[in-house]
């Protein structure tokens, strides 16, 4: 008679995460008496997946019923498949013995491969604003995916990025996997509205993409430009000087305005103006009464904005002889308010 | 059981419309990518298009020139073929298969046959 | 576009092994070509065998196995039997589009 042979017909299984995975496997015949056992791996440190004889195994049910007589069928279900369950297994028979059950033949071993979906991509930024010219760096990142091969793409706006470095991790072998990438963009002024996407395709998603977004309105700040003009005003002792102050990201804007060096008053910028860019506009002006100066004023608007150094706009403001000649020592009446752009 | 059954095939002219159909049975639609191959007269098979789980993402032929347009209707398990300006050489079997994951096509239906001909 | 090409026609016999494969116009076949095996039986019954290079479809007999064999994808049918006479189509996934090969006209005999 021939002797038994132990079947596991498929070389390789490949099922999705979350599913159940069914590993087949034969005899050839009932001799000799003695139970079937299923590892997974070989050598001494294989680990025990199902036990015919004896034990709990909740994950586990077999196809046909193995007390059924003259059964060869010892195939398994095992169910809710993760990546950690990926691994050769193999149907092993023993021969009854005293005291232990002693090892007879094992089959060739069927390869589990798990098919698992990448996470949701996370995009972050940097950690500090920059300013348009400068080139910011957005990392995106997923997990758990497998197999290893994967395709990643950046955007900006709709337009695919080329600077940008992807790893996978790790490099050989393994249940699962790991994509990080960086990618490199060069602000530009009108990046306010802009946003950046990390697309990840994966043979689980269905054809469906995963994408991550990053707002750059997070990453760049848009120094303002100023200009100070003098109004035209009906009162021939009163002059009325403007600041504009331009096209700034993002909102955090303190304007102090400076006669002759010294301060005459400070403002934060409260009601503003929003550009099609995104970026904001906001005006202050200040009555200067012209009666009170002998001499040639220089008004300076000086702005912070966004916590960064200081710039300022100057402005000389001319006295005539006129009202030199007739100067008195009136303190001068200075306002500020805000308005909006001309 | 999975069953793709393709429908909506005949006899058209050249310029005219034909709109394909493939009920599909024994699985979610929505969780499968799906795709038409056509086989003309003799011919191997080509790939026409390919249309993403959810269906907002779809895969053409450069070949087809946006003349066909793959679309789905996930509630009613069925995919389409909307097919324009048809010519004599895009006389062929269609068949509906379906994508086990992206990369394995495993079930196929039966196909259903296009004709163009004045 | 790329051209994917297979062998017209193979013969074997019953209990042989045999091996089709399926080569790129790009290069060497990768598994990011995600290389797949279609089989035609007489009246356009289209089977799924392997998808993703070596995974076979559920139902599909074991003796049907995908491979990469030096720069081509390969279908191996160890021990051929006299039903698997048909058409083996091979297909080839290229960043967005599949291409199919001419196929392979294989006989047992």
């Known amino acids: 008679e021939d002797e038994l042979q132990v079947i596991q017909p498929e070389k390789s299984v490949s099922v999705a995460a979350g599913e159940s995975a069914t590993l087949r496997c034969a005899m050839t015949s009932l001799i000799p008496v003695g139970p079937i056992m299923w590892f997974r791996g070989a050598g001494a440190g294989r680990e025990l997946i199902y036990n015919q004889k004896e034990g709990h195994f909740p994950r586990v049910t077999t196809v046909s019923e193995l007390t059924k007589r003259n059964n060869l069928d010892f195939s398994i279900s095992i169910s809710n498949i993760t990546p950690a369950d990926a691994g050769t297994y193999y149907c092993v028979k023993f021969r009854k013995g005293s005291p232990d059950d002693v090892e007879f033949k094992s089959g060739a071993g069927t390869e589990l491969s798990v098919r698992a979906k990448p996470s949701a991509p996370v995009v972050s930024g940097p950690a500090v604003r920059a300013t348009p010219e400068h080139t910011v760096s957005f990392t995106c990142e997923s997990h758990g995916f497998s197999p290893r091969d994967i395709t990643l793409k950046w955007f900006k706006n709709g337009n695919e990025l080329s600077d940008f470095q992807t790893n996978v991790d790790p490099a050989g072998d393994s249940v699962s996997y790991s994509i990080h990438s960086t990618a490199r963009v060069v602000l530009t002024r009108g990046d306010v509205h802009s946003q950046v996407i990390c697309e990840i395709a994966h043979i689980t998603l269905q054809g469906d993409p995963l994408r991550g977004t990053a707002n750059l309105s997070e990453a760049i700040r848009v120094p303002p430009t100023l200009e100070v003009t003098q109004q035209p005003m009906r009162a021939e002792n009163q002059a009325n000087v403007t600041c504009q102050v331009s096209n700034f990201y993002p909102r955090g804007l303190q304007l102090t305005w400076l006669e002759n060096g010294n301060v005459s008053r400070t403002e934060t910028a409260s009601t503003l103006i929003e550009n099609k860019d995104g970026t904001y506009n906001w005006m202050s002006w200040l009555l200067v009464n012209t009666c009170a100066h002998r001499d040639d004023v220089v008004l300076t608007c000086q702005v912070e904005h966004d916590g960064q150094q200081a710039v300022s706009k100057s402005y000389a403001l001319e006295i005539s002889a006129h009202q030199k000649e007739h100067g008195s020592d009136i303190t001068h009446e200075a306002a500020l308010a805000p308005t909006a752009p001309l | 059981e999975v069953q793709l059954l393709e429908s909506g095939g005949g006899l058209v002219q050249p310029g005219g419309s034909l709109r394909l159909s493939c009920a599909a049975s024994g699985f979610t639609l929505s969780s499968y990518a799906m795709s038409w191959v056509r086989q003309a007269p003799g011919k191997g098979l080509e790939w026409v298009s390919i249309?993403?789980?959810?269906?907002?993402?779809?895969y053409n032929a450069d070949s087809l020139k946006g003349r066909f347009t793959i679309s789905r209707d996930n509630s009613k398990n069925t995919l389409f073929l909307q097919m324009n300006s048809l010519r004599a050489e895009d006389t062929a079997v269609y068949y509906c298969a379906r994508l086990r994951f992206f990369d394995w096509f495993d079930y196929w239906g039966q196909g259903a046959l296009v004709t163009v001909s004045s | 576009q790329a051209v994917v090409t297979q062998e017209s026609a193979l013969t074997t016999s019953p209990g042989e092994t045999v091996t089709l494969t399926c080569r790129s116009s790009t290069g060497a076949v990768t598994t990011s070509n995600y290389a797949n095996w279609v089989q035609e039986k007489p009246d356009h019954l289209f089977t799924g065998l392997i998808g993703g290079t070596n995974n076979r479809t559920p139902g599909v007999p074991a003796r049907f196995s995908g491979s990469l064999i030096g720069d081509k994808a390969a279908l191996t049918i160890t021990g051929a039997q006299t039903e698997d006479e048909a058409i083996y189509f091979c297909?080839?996934?290229?960043?967005?589009?599949?291409?199919f090969g001419g196929g392979t006209k294989l006989t047992v005999l």
């Open positions: 249309s993403s789980g959810s269906g907002a993402n779809t």
């Open positions: 297909a080839l996934w290229y960043s967005n589009h599949w291409v």
